[in-house]
Structures are given as C-alpha cells and as structure tokens.
C-alpha cells in the first residue's frame, strides 16, 4: 500500500527570517566578491557570538516575531548589545570608507536595487530550505512505502 505524497505546509522556523535579514543587510553593506563564502563566515561569527555571550539572535528574532501575540515572552531576554548600538554591527564588517565613493548609482537607485537584491537573496535562501524540506519529505514517503511493502 502506498501513502500519498503529503502536502503538509512546513512553517519557516521562527527567527530564521530574522537571521536572513541580518545576512542580507551585511551583504548589501559589505558587498563581498564571494557571497557564499561571506555567508558562511557570517553565520560562523554568529555562532561564535552565541557561544561567547549566550545571546542567540535567532531566538531573539523569534521573540520579536512573537511580540504581537505574547508581550511577556519579549521581556524575558533583552539583547546584551541594546545599550550600545555600535556593537550591533557584524563582526565581519570593516570595509573602509573609500569603498562608498566608488559605488556607481545614485542613492535612490541604490535603495531600489538593494530592496530588490534583498528580496532575491532571501528568496534564494528560502528556496534552498524548501528544496531541502521537499527532499526530506520524499525520502520519508519512500521509506514508508518500503515499510508497507515489507509487511
């Protein structure tokens, strides 16, 4: 007996959108030559930060998302950086001032491009996650089919 392919809707984990937005902001600000390498270093630096400070930006992000539904959850964990906005800048920032001088477009055009780029980057990551989920679901359904046949 075969089990029909599940059309269960998987929700993007809370705080994940927040992480992607952080990465997107850094990519737009730092403009690396190698975006995948930059993303890897970015997430690595967040993990290091989490280990050192016990502050998890993803958890914080999920609480920000929950704020609408439950104000108390938001009060539980304040981010340690809150007092110093300068510290909010990523650990992998550091491009010098000179860079901004050489950017091609007017600031208005840049803003539009950055918005479009942000959407593209986030969509690409979400697409990747969706594909991974689909792979898992397919594997699970195949395993279930095999189990049924072996009965």
């Amino acid at each position: 007996m075969s089990i029909p392919f599940s059309n269960t809707h998987y929700r993007i984990p809370q705080g994940f959108g927040n992480l992607l937005e952080g990465l997107t902001r850094e990519i737009l600000r730092e403009q690396p030559d190698n975006i995948p390498a930059f993303a890897a270093a970015y997430f690595e630096s967040l993990l290091e930060k989490r280990e050192k400070t016990n502050f998890d930006p993803a958890e914080w992000g999920s609480k920000v998302e929950d704020r609408f539904y439950n104000n108390h959850a938001f009060e539980e964990q304040e981010p340690p950086e809150k007092s110093d906005p300068k510290q909010e800048e990523s650990q992998i920032s550091g491009k010098e001032e000179e860079t901004s001088v050489t950017i091609l477009d007017s600031s208005e055009e840049d803003k539009e491009k950055e918005e479009v780029a942000a959407v593209k980057i986030q969509a690409a990551f979400r697409g990747h996650i969706a594909r991974e989920e689909a792979k898992k679901m397919k594997t699970n359904s195949l395993q279930n089919e095999e189990k049924e046949e072996n009965k």
Partner: antibody
C-alpha cells in the same frame, strides 16, 4: 569547472568607446563578483572595477570613474565592461576575473580569469 | 588608497634554489573577521595571471606546495622553496581589504 570567455580583439579610434564581454560557463554566476583588470604593454596589473550580479551594484577605481561602466546580464551569465573617451594610453589587454566556488575568501582570490581581450587605440 | 610596495623588482635565481618576494602595504590588510586580504598571483609570459595564494597564506587549488605565503597586517612574503624553470614570470601581490583593489608593481623572476 567555471570558465570565463572574453570577446575578441578590438581596434578603436581615440574618443570612441569599446565594450568587452565576459561570459561565464559552468557554476553559479550571480553570487560572485566579476572584476575587470587591465594591463598596458610592458606594464603591471591594474584593477578597474567590479560588479556583483545579484546586487546589480558596481564599484570603480577612482581613475576610471565616469569613463567606465560595468554591467551584468544574469540571463546570459555575461559581464560587460565599457570604456568611453578612449585615448592611446588605454591600449591594453583587458581581463575579467572572479573567485571560484572552491575559494573560502569573501574578497579577492581571483582564481578564474578570462583569456584577455586586446584593445588597441590608434588613429 | 592603499599602496603596495614589492621587492625586489627583479629576481634572478638558479633552479633548485629558494626565492623570496616581499610585499609591504601602507595600511593593515587584516579585517575584523581575522583574515589578511592579500593575494599572490603569477603571470607567466603570454598568459593570464593565476592565483597562487589568498588570505595571505592559503595556497590556491592545484598550486605546488613549494609555494607558501606568510605575514600579517602590513608585511607579507611569498616563498618558493626550490625554484623550477616553469616558475618564471611576474609575481604580483594584491590587496582585497577594500576597493579599489590594488596590485603591487610586480617582481620578475628569471632563471640564472
């Protein structure tokens, strides 16, 4: 394995413009910046600028600002470098370059280069 | 704009001997991510440049282990443990810590 294929040699008159293309084949195009580097006869390497296709943002060296335009067409995985108001000093070999997917550096590390395009500016 | 100064500009070496090229930057190439954004390239006669070393000391794929990069901040060195005939060409360092990216003047290695 990613490869960069550049357009053929050009002979131009002073004051005119030249547009050199650089087509990437194999691998991902949008997530890796393409830089343009030129080399005048008997001289060293000179970075002109770059474009990050997914962002649509280009950066230029001050020396070329206002004369160079770098663009990218994601649908054809091709980057372009257009240099205007040409003068004899612009006679050079023009290279496009980018990092490969193997490289772990966020900046630089150009391990893929085009074969070069010779641009001769002569009246 | 960062300035890179290479030395020597000319380097005659006998096959099998070691060789060393220095690259000095006018300001630090160390970013807050802990990496030195300095690359070494070799341009053989009539060819496109090829990457030898990136991030100051990471050998690029397919580069023989006789090539090694070292240094941090403003002072960097490319060493060839035993020069071979195929190593002739011009060696360039390049900083990638900020745009505009800048190349050194180049060091011409020739066989004695």
């Amino acid at each position: 394995q990613v490869q960069l294929q550049q357009s053929g040699a050009e002979v131009k008159k002073p004051g005119s413009s030249v547009k050199v293309s650089c087509k990437a084949s194999g691998g991902t195009f949008s997530s890796y910046a393409i830089s343009w580097v030129r080399q005048a006869p008997g001289q060293g390497l000179e970075w002109m600028g770059r474009i990050i296709p997914i962002l649509g943002i280009a950066n230029y060296a001050q020396k070329f600002q206002g004369r160079v335009t770098i663009t990218a067409d994601k649908s054809t995985s091709t980057a372009y470098m257009e240099l205007s108001s040409l003068r004899s000093e612009d006679t050079a070999v023009y290279y496009c370059a980018r990092p490969s997917e193997e490289v772990v550096a966020a900046y630089g590390a150009f391990d893929i280069w085009g074969q070069g395009t010779t641009v001769t500016v002569s009246s | 704009e960062i300035v890179l100064t290479q030395s020597p500009l000319s380097l005659p070496v006998r096959p099998g001997e070691p060789a060393s090229i220095s690259c000095r930057a006018s300001q630090s190439l160390l970013r807050s991510d802990g990496f030195n954004y300095l690359d070494w390239y070799l341009q053989k006669p009539g060819q496109s440049p090829q990457l030898l070393v990136y991030l100051g000391s990471n050998r690029a794929s397919g580069v023989p282990d006789r090539f090694s990069g070292s240094g941090s901040g403003t002072d960097f060195t490319l060493k060839i443990s035993r020069v071979e005939a195929e190593d002739v060409g011009v060696y360039y360092c390049m900083q990638a810590v900020q745009t505009p990216y800048i190349f050194g003047q180049g060091t011409k290695l020739e066989i004695k």
